[in-house]
């Protein structure tokens, strides 16, 4: 029988400076494109090699982005969230939620809807 998989959830403020090719990551999610069941939040789906986010090192694929420059990302359409990032300026402050998998007991498995999958 598999052990229970728990998650350690932490929040962090990440300040990025837009590089020559931008911020350097992709997002999924939004009210019209739920990435996680019953959650219309915005998640990081890809970190671009050598981009601003990768060079900073703190933002991870699977992180949930809670706000951009203090603006809440709740209840946004996907494209509205994309536009918010694109218009965020040179210095961009992200409030992010990291979700670290913590294994209890025998090895479990990651569910289909897990954003870190």
């Amino acid at each position: 029988m598999n052990g229970r998989v728990d998650y350690l959830v932490t929040e962090e403020e990440i300040n990025l400076t837009r590089g020559p090719s931008g911020l350097g990551f992709n997002i999924v999610g939004g009210t019209d494109q739920q990435y996680v069941s019953n959650d219309s939040g915005i998640y990081v789906s890809r970190i671009k090699e050598n981009g601003a986010a990768a060079l900073d090192g703190r933002l991870q694929e699977g992180d949930k982005i809670l706000s951009v420059n203090g603006q809440d990302l709740k209840n946004l359409l996907h494209q509205d969230a994309v536009d918010l990032f694109r218009n965020a300026g040179y210095a961009v402050s992200l409030r992010v939620q990291h979700r670290l998998q913590v294994q209890n007991g025998p090895i479990g498995h990651r569910g289909e809807g897990d954003p870190s999958g």
Epitope: S21, N26, R46
Partner: nanobody, 125 residues
Framework: DVQLVESGGGLVQAGGSLRLSCAAS????????MAWFRQGPGKEREFVAT????????YYADSVKGRFTISRDNAKNTVYLQMNSLKPEDTAVYYC???????????????????WGQGTQVTVS
């Protein structure tokens, strides 16, 4: 990850039409931003068109605007490039590209895409 296979290229006369297809294998195709790039003889690979996750967020290179149309069918895991009024300068190898999610930066740059097909040759005489 996603694998991409292009088809539909060929030889066509100036003023003619072709429709390119890019079939994707892998999960969650509807979450990928898809694009077409091309590389003409002796030239660098250049952006042609891109389409967002839900047949939205469509952008074209100025050189193809009004002549080319990008579209996608998420049920078939396929993206298309309808090319009309073809010109000799459209001669190139056309590549399909994909990236998971939506780039928060410009989707017009080659560096925005992680997955590439092998290309299909289009020759306009």
């Amino acid at each position: 990850d996603v694998q991409l296979v292009e088809s539909g290229g060929g030889l066509v006369q100036a003023g003619g039409s072709l429709r390119l297809s890019c079939a994707a294998s892998g999960r969650s195709f509807d979450r990928y931003t898809m694009a077409w790039f091309r590389q003409g003889p002796g030239k660098e690979r250049e952006f042609v068109a891109t389409v967002g996750w839900n047949d939205n967020s469509i952008y074209y290179a100025d050189s193809v605007k009004g002549r080319f149309t990008i579209s996608r069918d998420n049920a078939k895991n396929t993206v298309y490039l309808q090319m009309n009024s073809l010109k000799p300068e459209d001669t190139a190898v056309y590549y399909c590209a994909a990236t998971f999610g939506s780039p928060v930066d410009t989707p017009l740059d080659r560096g925005a895409y992680d997955f590439w097909g092998q290309g299909t040759q289009v020759t306009v005489s």
